[in-house]
C-alpha cells in the first residue's frame, strides 16, 4: 500500500527521507525492458530496504528489484507499458513510501555511439555522424539528439545543437582554425514516450585546419 505502516504504527524509520527516482529503458536487451531506481539521498541506510513494482504488469501482480550496490534494478518482459505502476520502498512486508509512475514517462534512451567527424575539403565543412540503437527498436524510435561541442581549451563553453536525425553539418567558418575540438552527443525521447537524457556518448576529438594565408581558407588536416 502507499503510505505507512501495515499495523498503523509509525516508527522512527519513517521519519527518514526515502525519496527515490527511477528510469526505464525499453527493449534494452532484445525484447527485455529494464527499470532502475535509486534513493535521492546517498546517505540512506539501504541495508534492509527493498523495492517492489506492482500494477501495469503482464501475468504477475508484483515484481521485486535486484539490489546492485546503491541501485535497484529489474530486467523483464512483463511491463505492460499502459497505465501507472506502483513502485514502493519496503522493509520486510511494510511499505515506507510509494510512487505511481507510468514507465513510458521515465524513459532514458541508450547512449548514442560511433560518433565521428569527417572534414569535407571542397565543402569547407565537417560532417558529424553517429549511431543509435533506437533505430531498430519497436517502442522508443523517435529521439531528439543534443550534439555538444567545444574547443578543448574552453572548459565549459559548450555549443549545443538539437536535431532529430543522426547527421549534422558544422560549417568550417563557424569554428576556430587550427584548434582541437571535443564533440559528444546524447538523446531524449521525442514522441509519445517521455523521460530523461541518455548518458553522453564517448567524446570524439578533431582538429580544424589552419587558415591558408593566400586564400584565407583553412588547410585540411
Amino acid at each position: 500500500e502507499s503510505g505507512y505502516a501495515q499495523n498503523g504504527d509509525l516508527e522512527d524509520a519513517e521519519l527518514d527521507d526515502y525519496s527515490f527516482s527511477c528510469y526505464s529503458q525499453l527493449e534494452v536487451n532484445g525484447s527485455q525492458h529494464s527499470l532502475t531506481c535509486a534513493f535521492e539521498d546517498p546517505d540512506v541506510n539501504i541495508t534492509n530496504l527493498e523495492f517492489e513494482i506492482c500494477g501495469a504488469l503482464v501475468e504477475v501482480k508484483c515484481l521485486n528489484f535486484r539490489k546492485l550496490q546503491e541501485i535497484y534494478f529489474i530486467e523483464t518482459k512483463k511491463f505492460l507499458l499502459i497505465g501507472k505502476s506502483n513502485i514502493c520502498v519496503k522493509v520486510g512486508e511494510k511499505s515506507l513510501t510509494c510512487k505511481k509512475i507510468d514507465l513510458t514517462t521515465i524513459v532514458k534512451p541508450e547512449a548514442p555511439f560511433d560518433l565521428s567527424v569527417v572534414y569535407r575539403e571542397g565543402a569547407n565543412d565537417f560532417v558529424v555522424t553517429f549511431n543509435t540503437s533506437h533505430l531498430q527498436k519497436k517502442y522508443v524510435k523517435v529521439l531528439m539528439h543534443d550534439v555538444a561541442y567545444r574547443q578543448e581549451k574552453d572548459e565549459n563553453k559548450w555549443t549545443h545543437v538539437n536535431l532529430s536525425s543522426t547527421k549534422l553539418t558544422l560549417l568550417q567558418r563557424k569554428l576556430q582554425p587550427a584548434a582541437m575540438y571535443e564533440i559528444k552527443v546524447r538523446s531524449i525521447p521525442d514522441h509519445y514516450f517521455k523521460g530523461f537524457w541518455s548518458e553522453w556518448s564517448p567524446s570524439y576529438y578533431f582538429r580544424t585546419p589552419e587558415i591558408n594565408n593566400s586564400s584565407g581558407e583553412m588547410d585540411p588536416i
Epitope: 500500500e1 502507499s2 503510505g3 505507512y4 505502516a5 501495515q6 499495523n7 498503523g8 504504527d9 509509525l10 517492489e52 506492482c54 500494477g55 501495469a56 501475468e59 501482480k61 508484483c62 501507472k84 506502483n86 514502493c88 519496503k90 512486508e93 511499505s95 510509494c98 505511481k100
Partner: antibody, heavy 122, light 106 residues
Framework: QVQLQQPGAELVMPGASVKLSCKAS????????MHWVKQRPGEGLEWIGE????????NDNQKFKGKATLTVDKSSSTAYMQLSSLTSEDSAVYYC???????????????WGQGTSVTVSS | DIQMTQSPSSLSASLGGKVTITCKAS??????IAWYQHKPGKGPRLLIH???TLQPGIPSRFSGSGSGRDYSFSISNLEPVDIATYYC????????FGAGTKLELK
C-alpha cells in the same frame, strides 16, 4: 479495532446526485486502499472501484465510469463515493471495504462497512 | 473481464455435515481468489484469500483449494452460525464476484 462507519440509508430523487461516506478508524487510513461495492436487492455483489487514500489514485470498473466518483479526505480518515444522475437502477446497498495490505492493484478486501442503502424514488 | 461461475446457487445441509462450493473462472486467475460469508444487514466477512489462506480468527472448519480456473471452498462440521450466503471473488485482474451460494439448514 478496524471499523468502517457508513450511514444506514439515503433517499434521493431521480436525476439527483448523492455522496456516500465511509469513516475509517482503528488503523492508518493512508496505508490501505478502499474499495466500493454495489449490491442490488436480491442480487450479488458488484465491484465499483478502489482508491488509494495516500494519493487519491483510483482503479475503476469501466461500467461505473461517469456514474461513480471516488474521493478521500485524509484529515478525517473518510472515503467518499459520489453517484450522479441517479435512476432506479442505482437503488442498492453500497459497501465500502478496506483492502488487504498489498502494493498491487486489484486486491481482496478484509474489513467491510455495514453498507448504505440508497433508494432512488420521487 | 473475468467471469466467475459459482455453483450451486443454493445448498441445503445438515448440522455437523460438510458442504463444498465451487467457482470456475473464465481464465486462469493464478490463485487470486477469496471467499466471503455474507449475512443480511451486515457487511461481508473475509474467510479465505489467495485460494487457501485462512484469515486470522476464522475457524479451521473453513478451507479452500484450487488452481488455474477451478477453485473450491468447503465448510466441515457445519454449525448454525454458518448459515449465510457465500461469495467467491477473483482479484487477478479487476475484481469480479461469483453470483453467490445461499446455504440453508436441512
Amino acid at each position: 479495532q478496524v471499523q468502517l462507519q457508513q450511514p444506514g440509508a439515503e433517499l434521493v430523487m431521480p436525476g439527483a446526485s448523492v455522496k456516500l461516506s465511509c469513516k475509517a478508524s482503528g488503523y492508518t487510513f493512508t496505508s490501505y486502499w478502499m474499495h466500493w461495492v454495489k449490491q442490488r436487492p436480491g442480487e450479488g455483489l458488484e465491484w465499483i472501484g478502489e482508491i488509494d487514500p495516500s494519493d487519491s489514485y483510483t482503479n475503476d470498473n469501466q461500467k461505473f465510469k461517469g456514474k461513480a466518483t471516488l474521493t478521500v479526505d485524509k484529515s478525517s480518515s473518510t472515503a467518499y463515493m459520489q453517484l450522479s444522475s441517479l435512476t432506479s437502477e442505482d437503488s442498492a446497498v453500497y459497501y465500502c471495504a478496506r483492502r488487504l495490505y498489498s502494493n498491487s492493484y486489484y486486491y481482496a478486501m478484509d474489513y467491510w462497512g455495514q453498507g448504505t442503502s440508497v433508494t432512488v424514488s420521487s | 473481464d473475468i467471469q466467475m461461475t459459482q455453483s450451486p446457487s443454493s445448498l441445503s445441509a445438515s448440522l455437523g455435515g460438510k458442504v463444498t462450493i465451487t467457482c470456475k473462472a473464465s481464465q486462469d486467475i493464478k490463485k487470486y481468489i477469496a471467499w466471503y460469508q455474507h449475512k443480511p444487514g451486515k457487511g461481508p466477512r473475509l474467510l479465505i484469500h489467495y485460494t487457501s489462506t485462512l484469515q486470522p480468527g476464522i475457524p479451521s472448519r473453513f478451507s479452500g483449494s484450487g488452481s488455474g480456473r477451478d477453485y473450491s471452498f468447503s465448510i466441515s462440521n457445519l454449525e448454525p452460525v454458518d448459515i449465510a450466503t457465500y461469495y467467491c471473488l477473483q482479484y487477478d485482474n479487476l475484481l469480479t464476484f461469483g453470483a453467490g451460494t445461499k446455504l440453508e439448514l436441512k
